[in-house]
């Protein structure tokens, strides 16, 4: 709100732009016939300092010279970098009610001389692009600083462009707007950047380059791939490039990969054959270009081409297992299960599985296709049966995998020994065993199979299994292992035509059960009491139950109860006890024990035996 210096003037010595650390003298002078009316001697000139439009100091005490009622000079020091505003005001001391009147003002800029620009770098994007250079300006000057970019070259070629930096914009890049053509490929060019402000000037060192040094080809475009005879592993990658390109770099990877396959192609002319692709795999392809074999820069990578390679017929063999159960006097139900092929083996979308069950001697064959990973059939119990399964996609089928249907636990001599199951952590169990002691035929492989000890559908909840080579005696099972669930684990030893198995229960984590078994009945037979119970519901077991405990004590007794501990067997739901006195009323209850501890007690039942004491 300065009224354009109607009352007087303000001047700065040595200049309104000063180097950091310098002092300045500011003089404020009233024009003739201006000032406080009637009493010129009462004219008082004051100087106010503003930073970012905020009053920060009254410089009354910094006067170094004073012509009373006419002019005053103030010395200012320790000015910070950037711009500071000083306003001179007139204070008529005889009139306390009137505020000081602005006289004039001045801006002082504090800065530094520019440093020589460094790290000049020039590029021309594409054969038809223009030369643009960038540089590092060095320290901020806090002053308006002009930069001039000059280029000189053969045939008296000269060119220059300018820009400036101030507190609102930065100048560290200029486009000269000229195009260097390939016919100047061997020529040398020199660029220099000069910086000038009110406190000084500086120049960069000259930067020399050739056409090849600075021209960056445009990235290739219009990328496409053609698969030879719909092959899933071979394809021709094609693209468009600038005319002078002599070298390309190709990179490609499956979409879920973290490392690229890299290929260099010389004089590819926009075409390259790839031979090592994985069928039915989403790939990403990118290409970069260079104008010279040894010198020059690579272009940026092209935009990605994303595409899926075609299918090829499945390879690899299916992992088959089965379950066998007699379902009447001369028939058995065979349930075949198999694991899906992994993507590198499936090499396409598996449309169906071809399943064959064959009776070897009578040459009876049952065939079917299914989209599921299991298949169940009822067949005679007689005869030697073999099963095979193959997987089919749109291009063909895998080689069938064969398995002989044997009685998996039929040969005691083939049963593995010393089977143990240890919880390793929350979601796996380590199973170990020793080989069969007196196997009359060689073990071809072990199968470790596990199922949750929970009611389940035979076909909806297939078994989980691992195939183990015959020289291994351990398996870490983790597929579908959940904490606080008990699993029945079988280790099968298979020979060519026989099988033996051993079972164990195991869990990956356990807690004490939520409740004890529920006593349903107490009956007396031949001087023995039979306690009957219902098992703890599966969700409340919280691991493998090791044993049940039956407790009893005389009613109203404060003595410790007696107890009987019985090994847990799912098939057992009653147990005799025989140490109770006749005609004494007892209270009985049960608990269950896992490796983590004992459950709370189940329901209490009272009973008074009638028979004579044992």
């Amino acid at each position: 709100n300065i009224d354009v210096c109607k009352l007087g003037t303000v001047t700065v010595q040595p200049a309104p732009v000063i180097p950091l650390g310098s002092a300045a003298n500011i003089s404020c002078s009233l024009n003739p016939k201006q000032g406080c009316s009637h009493y010129p001697s009462s004219n008082e000139l004051i100087l106010l300092k503003f930073v970012n439009d905020v009053l920060v100091e009254n410089l009354h005490g910094k006067k170094v010279h004073d012509h009373t009622g006419h002019s005053s000079t103030f010395q200012v020091t320790n000015l910070s970098l950037g711009m500071t505003l000083f306003v001179c005001k007139l204070n008529c001391s005889n009139s306390q009610k009137k505020p000081p009147v602005p006289v004039c003002g001045v801006e002082i800029s504090v800065g530094v001389a520019p440093e020589p620009p460094q790290n000049i770098s020039c590029v021309q994007e594409g054969e038809n692009g223009t030369v643009a250079c960038s540089w590092n300006s060095g320290k901020v000057t806090y002053l308006k600083t002009n930069y001039t970019l000059q280029l000189s070259g053969p045939n008296n070629l000269t060119c220059q462009k300018q820009c400036f930096s101030d507190n609102r914009q930065n100048c560290n890049r200029l486009d000269l707007g000229i195009n260097l053509s390939p016919d100047l490929a061997e020529s040398r060019f020199i660029v220099r950047v000069t910086a000038i402000n009110d406190l000084g000037n500086s120049s960069s060192l000259p930067h020399t380059f050739t056409f090849l040094d600075i021209v960056i080809p445009l990235p290739p475009w219009d990328i496409r791939i053609n698969f030879l005879n719909a092959s899933g592993s071979r394809g021709t990658l094609q693209w468009e490039d600038e005319g002078q390109v002599v070298l390309n770099q190709l990179r490609y990877q499956p979409l879920n990969s973290t490392s690229w396959n890299m290929v260099n192609a010389t004089n590819a002319k926009g075409k390259y054959d790839l031979r090592d692709l994985r069928p039915f795999t989403e790939y990403e392809f990118q290409i970069s270009s260079k104008l010279h074999l040894s010198g020059g820069s690579w272009s940026n990578w092209s935009e990605s081409l994303r595409t899926r390679t075609p299918e090829e017929e499945p390879v690899g063999i299916l992992d088959i297992w089965y379950m066998k159960q007699d379902i009447d006097y001369d028939r058995q139900q065979i349930s075949l299960f198999w694991k899906s092929l992994n993507p590198s083996e499936a090499r396409g979308k598996i449309l169906h599985y071809q399943v064959t069950l064959q009776e070897v001697t009578k040459k009876t064959t049952l065939q079917n296709t299914t989209r599921h990973t299991s298949w169940t059939r009822v067949i005679p119990r007689t005869g030697a049966w073999t099963a095979s399964v193959s997987a089919a996609n749109s291009k063909g089928a895998s080689a069938p995998t064969h398995i002989n249907i044997v009685d998996l636990c039929g040969t005691g001599l083939l049963a593995p020994h010393q089977v143990s199951a240890k919880s390793e952590n929350m979601d796996n169990i380590l199973v170990t065993w020793q080989p069969p002691k007196k196997a009359d035929s060689a073990v071809r492989e072990y199968i470790v199979e596990w199922r949750a000890l929970q009611p389940g559908s035979i076909t909806k909840f297939p078994p989980h299994w691992l195939r183990i080579p015959p020289d291994n005696m351990s398996a870490l099972i983790s597929e579908n292992i959940k904490p606080y669930i008990c699993y029945e684990i079988r280790v099968h030893a298979l020979s060519e035509s026989q099988g033996g198995c051993s079972s164990i229960r195991g869990d990956s984590k356990h807690k004490a059960p939520v409740s004890g078994p529920h006593i349903t009945a107490i009956t007396e037979k031949k001087e023995r009491l039979f306690i009957s119970w219902t098992h703890i519901p599966f969700p409340e077991q919280r691991g493998c139950i090791l044993h049940y405990r039956i407790y009893w004590k005389e009613r109203d007794s404060t003595a410790q109860p007696e107890l009987c501990e019985i090994q847990y067997r799912r098939s057992q739901n009653s147990h005799p006890i025989s140490s109770l006195q006749p005609r004494v009323t007892y209270v009985l209850w049960m608990t269950a024990v896992t490796a983590a501890g004992e459950s709370p007690q189940g329901n209490e039942r009272e009973f008074c035996p009638q028979g004579k004491a044992n």
């Epitope: 009611p455 076909t459 029945e488």
Partner: nanobody, 119 residues
């Protein structure tokens, strides 16, 4: 526990049809594999047909093409449609459900329904 109740049996002329029904109740959350068996006088009980959780079915050879097993999960029911009945199909027909706990198979049986085919 699981309870199974059959119905739909009766006396029918050779060449006729009957539809047997079996309804499951109780702890049926894991009962997906349902079977029909039959036992003729003086003979052992034999498998007739089954249907799996994935609606895959399988039949005893002599009834294949004449009998059809189906299910209605909403009603917890399984059915046996018997067409072109023959005198040798005369038997008590039983509904059966199997479930697996670990490697042990638990079986549940209905009371049976009499089918008599007269010539």
């Amino acid at each position: 526990q699981v309870q199974l109740q059959e119905s739909g049996g009766g006396l029918v002329q050779a060449g006729g049809s009957l539809r047997l029904s079996c309804t499951a109740s109780g702890s049926i959350f894991a009962i997906d594999d349902m079977y029909w068996y039959r036992q003729a006088p003086g003979k052992q009980r034999e498998f007739v047909a089954y249907i799996t959780a994935t609606n895959s079915a399988n039949y005893l050879d002599p009834v294949n093409g004449r009998f059809t097993i189906s299910r209605d999960n909403a009603k917890n029911s399984v059915y046996l449609q018997m067409n072109s009945l023959k005198p040798e199909d005369t038997a008590v027909y039983y509904c059966n459900a199997k479930q697996i706990v670990g490697f042990q198979i638990d079986e549940y049986w209905g009371q049976g329904t009499q089918v008599t085919v007269s010539s």
